[in-house]
Interface confidence: low
């Protein structure tokens, strides 16, 4: 198992082997087999199943062994501890990052990693990409950062900073993790956003015309969602008028937090006859189908 910390900060690690809290735990420097003392006056000392670096130094990096002595079995665990120098810039390298959290709810909480190992007191300070969070949307409570009305702009690296108290001395601890926003999908009956219901569009005889129909289907990738055109309740391809074509392919977009598709009907040269036709835009998915009828009139 691996643990890491920053130079001049407190680091507390737990023995990777688990045993009853009553069983004694001994810690050793793995390479020298030298026992680590329990006296608190030492900078590195043992407290039950925990090894404390108060504060940590780069030279403390190495492999530590813990032995849990139970009546019928000794269990040994090994811990690879790496103490890093504080990064000079705000870009926190991957090796100093705790697990990424993914949020899909409008309100979300981020937990400060490893805080439970420490004797800490509120408040915990939170930073995003090294800037202190002061907006009222961000609230620190216990070991959590609550974010209200989460958006993609809230993605980034969040650092919590708190104080560990030991023997009347306070030590700083910081921990960083990434937060990414995962859109929560929802599906719904299609909504045609354009053109409006029973819309009449002005065109010029002899000139080309394009009618775009856009429909939205919820959020996420929508199974077999489609936008189609019909002329006088007949599919464009069967209508038998080469001047009128439905554009190939899907034009995908996002609007008001919803996924939408657009299909364009193109008339190469509008004729008088076209003014008497009904043009239906159909939006369909597994919830059902909706139809908006469009008519043309001379400009």
């Amino acid at each position: 198992k691996s643990s890491w910390g920053l130079e001049n900060e407190a680091l507390i690690v737990r023995c990777p082997q688990r045993g009853r809290s009553t069983y004694p735990v001994e810690w050793y420097y793995s390479d020298t087999n030298e026992s680590i003392p329990t006296q608190k006056r030492n900078r590195i000392f043992v407290s039950r199943d925990r090894l404390k670096f108060l504060p940590a130094r780069v030279e403390d990096s190495g492999i530590y062994a813990c032995v849990i002595r139970s009546p019928n079995l000794n269990k040994t665990g090994y811990l690879n501890v790496t103490i890093h120098k504080k990064p000079p810039s705000c870009n926190i390298p991957d090796y100093l990052m705790y697990s990424t959290v993914r949020g899909s709810d409008k309100n979300f909480k981020i937990t400060c990693p490893t805080i439970d190992l420490y004797n800490w007191t509120a408040p915990v300070q939170w930073f995003k990409n090294c800037k202190a969070l002061q907006e009222p949307r961000f609230r620190a409570h216990r070991s959590y950062l609550f974010i209200d009305n989460v958006t993609h702009d809230d993605e980034g690296d969040y650092t919590c900073q708190f104080t560990h108290a030991e023997n009347g001395t306070n030590y700083i601890v910081t921990a960083t993790r990434s937060f990414t926003v995962e859109e929560k999908g929802f599906s719904m009956f299609p909504v045609i956003t354009n053109p409006p219901y029973n819309h009449t569009m002005e065109v010029e005889i002899g000139k080309p015309a394009s009618i775009a129909c856009s429909a939205c289907f919820g959020k996420g990738s929508h199974f077999l969602a489609d936008v189609l055109w019909q002329i006088n309740k007949t599919v464009v391809g069967n209508f038998g008028e080469a001047r009128i074509q439905e554009e190939e392919g899907r034009n995908e977009s996002s609007s008001n937090d919803m996924d939408c598709l657009t299909s364009v009907l193109r008339i190469t040269g509008v004729t008088e006859k076209d003014l008497s036709l009904e043009y239906d835009c159909l939006a369909l998915n597994l919830h059902g189908m909706i139809r908006h009828t469009i008519r043309l009139r001379r400009k």
């Epitope: 959020k219 990738s221 077999l224 189609l228 899907r250 369909l284």
Partner: antibody, heavy 116, light 107 residues
């Protein structure tokens, strides 16, 4: 890489219950439809029903309504197909499918054999 | 429900030949129609959606046409890996339905 991994083959007796699974990975599970398709031995494909894990909207084909239950547990990105009382005629290969726009991903199939 | 009828049931052709598969719907499905390929022991694979749009990664020798009630899948020049069963599927009305399949076999 998007993957749908289905649970292993099952051999059951008539009247027994069964729940088979389909675990999605490599994509946002709550944002895509998952459908179940039956293929009886030597026969064609039949849509059984579909679920949208984002809001648990479920729709069944009339022939399968009341015969099976489709559900999903988004916390473990898994969709399920279950029977409360199997019949010999339920013997088939069952596929789960995730289809969105131009992409399609299918599970490897779960063979269910019901025999006394 | 909308019934899809595929023809022929079996098509015996040689590699390099042109394959034309037909799918007829019992009522108009506009162009909300997809084609799938299935090889023995494998899951189906989407070839064409919206009647004529090739899915990602599908070779140009596969093309779809038609709208309303009559649809065609054409394989311009059969490759050895194209011998399989082909299904059409409509998604215009619920329930979604498949045709019974056309088997393309080596002559």
């Amino acid at each position: 890489e998007v993957q749908l991994v289905q649970s292993g083959a099952e051999v059951k007796k008539p009247g027994e219950s069964l729940k088979i699974s389909c675990k999605g990975s490599g994509y946002s599970f709550t944002s895509y439809w998952i459908g179940w398709v039956r293929q009886m031995p030597g026969k064609g494909l039949e849509w059984m029903g579909i679920i949208y894990p984002g809001d648990s909207y479920t729709r069944y084909s009339p022939s399968f309504q009341g015969q099976v239950t489709i559900s999903a547990d988004k916390s473990i990105s898994t969709a399920y197909l279950q029977w409360s009382s199997l019949k010999a005629s339920d013997t088939a290969m069952y596929y789960c499918a995730r289809i969105g726009g131009m992409f399609d991903y299918w599970g490897q199939g779960t063979l269910v054999t019901v025999s006394s | 429900e909308i019934v899809l009828t595929q023809s022929p049931a079996t098509l015996s052709l040689s590699p390099g030949e042109r394959a034309t598969l037909s799918c007829r719907a019992s009522q108009s499905v506009a162009n909300a129609l997809a084609w799938y390929q299935q090889k023995p022991g494998q899951a189906p694979r989407l070839l064409i959606y919206k009647a004529s749009n090739r899915a990602t990664g599908i070779p140009a020798r596969f093309s779809g046409s038609g709208s309303g009630t009559d649809f065609t899948l054409t394989i311009s020049s059969l490759e050895p890996e194209d011998f399989a069963v082909y299904y059409c599927q409509q998604y215009y009305g619920w329930p979604i339905t498949f045709g019974q399949g056309t088997k393309v076999e080596i002559k």
